[in-house]
């Protein structure tokens, strides 16, 4: 099994739609179950985006390039929620996301109709297939939701910014 999320980081605007893409290939001939899971940051990311990150976090991540204080922590230290699951043609939203314009399209892409403030975080595309427990069954994209400020380019130069027309 191989799962790939092509965009590792994505910035989108508050109340705008977005699509988080996910591709997978598997040796299994059985239908796959697609699940998107949300994980909150381990600590506040917005402060870092505005250049206000703690010196402790900066020094730790400089010492250890593999470890990111915002992304790497036990799940029990952050919020973890199922956003949506797809089995066959049936898409089921997680309890927290019921009533929102969210679906899974094109096999495994997560489509969000209107972004909310609390949507910033890590989104994991997880594929489960029978007969295939080798390889890579998940990949993630970091989504940052921003309001309209006019300072967007200065805020996050390393992110690909997606602004969809209203």
């Amino acid at each position: 099994l191989q799962v790939t999320v092509p965009d590792k980081k994505k910035v989108a605007m508050l109340f705008q739609p977005t699509v988080l893409r996910c591709h997978f290939s598997t040796s299994s001939h059985q239908p796959a179950v697609v699940q998107w899971k949300f994980k909150s940051y381990c600590q506040d990311r917005m402060g870092e985006s505005l250049g206000m990150s703690s010196t402790r976090a900066q020094s730790l991540s400089k010492r250890n390039l593999e470890w990111d204080p915002y992304l790497d922590c036990l799940d029990s230290r952050r919020t973890v929620r199922v956003v949506a699951s797809k089995q066959g043609s049936t898409v089921t939203l997680g309890d927290f996301y019921r009533g929102r314009e969210i679906t899974i399209v094109h096999d495994a892409d997560l489509q969000i109709g209107k972004l909310m403030w609390g949507d910033s975080g890590l989104y994991y595309c997880i594929i489960t297939t029978p007969d295939d427990l080798e390889g890579k069954n998940e990949d993630s994209v970091e989504l940052l939701v921003l309001g309209r400020t006019g300072l967007l380019a200065d805020l996050l130069p390393s992110f690909a910014v997606e602004i969809m027309p209203e």
Partner: antibody, heavy 121, light 107 residues
């Protein structure tokens, strides 16, 4: 064939130290997160530590944090667990374990045979 | 951490019987539950993952079901070699945690 062989267990006094090793073969060790899981005399299974494939991220439960250190040598395909300030409640069979997927949330598809650690005066 | 509870520490059954072992999670774990078999003197062995998928080489008399917080592991026709301790484990969020185990005894 995936093989994982633990060693280094034994009898140690409270407050003592021990270093466990897990020699692996049959898979690309440097691709996988690796875990230490222990089984208490009451047969309860509990995770002790895990480490990312590159060795940069390590995680421990509060019960062993500050006393145990997980590490790996990807050139030698070997996982380690340095245990210090041992307590009687650390008495257990220690297993190294590997998930099925090299990246992602999956159960432990592969286990070593275990090495017994006994902490007693 | 998510707590996994297996309410029965022991279950007694006869060869040919159908037996079910239950496991309850302290919070929603979707379908991310595995079941292991541990025979005396051996390491745990993975039987079921993602609640209902049999691992490679596992006989089809072993099945799993459930989602959310309630999970069931079933042996449709118990064989003498099934004498073992069975553990559930959530692989939904780290740290992955185990149930206390259910020892299956053959009458």
């Amino acid at each position: 064939e995936v093989k994982m062989v633990e060693s280094g267990g034994g009898l140690v006094q409270p407050g003592g130290s021990l270093k466990l090793s897990c020699a692996t073969s049959g898979f690309t060790f440097s691709d996988y997160y690796m875990y230490w899981v222990r089984q208490t005399p009451e047969k309860r299974l509990e995770w002790v530590a895990y480490i990312s494939n590159g060795g940069g991220s390590t995680y421990y439960p509060d019960t062993v944090k500050g006393r145990f250190t997980i590490s790996r040598d990807n050139a030698k395909n070997t996982l380690y667990l340095q245990m210090s300030r041992l307590k009687s409640e650390d008495t257990a069979m220690y297993y190294c374990a590997r998930q099925g997927y090299y990246y992602g949330s999956s159960p432990f598809a592969y286990w070593g045979q275990g090495t017994l650690v006994t902490v007693s005066a | 951490d998510i707590v996994m509870t297996q309410s029965h520490k022991f279950m007694s059954t006869s060869v040919g019987d159908r037996v079910s072992i239950t496991c309850k999670a302290s919070q929603d774990v979707s379908t991310a539950v595995a079941w292991y078999q541990q025979k005396p003197g051996q390491s745990p062995k993975l039987l079921i993952y993602s609640a209902s998928y049999r691992y490679t080489g596992v006989p089809d008399r072993f099945t799993g079901s459930g989602s959310g917080t309630d999970f069931t592991f079933t042996i449709s026709s118990v064989q003498a070699e099934d004498l073992a301790v069975y553990y559930c484990q959530q692989h939904y969020s780290t740290p992955y945690t185990f149930g206390g185990g259910t020892k299956l005894e053959i009458k």
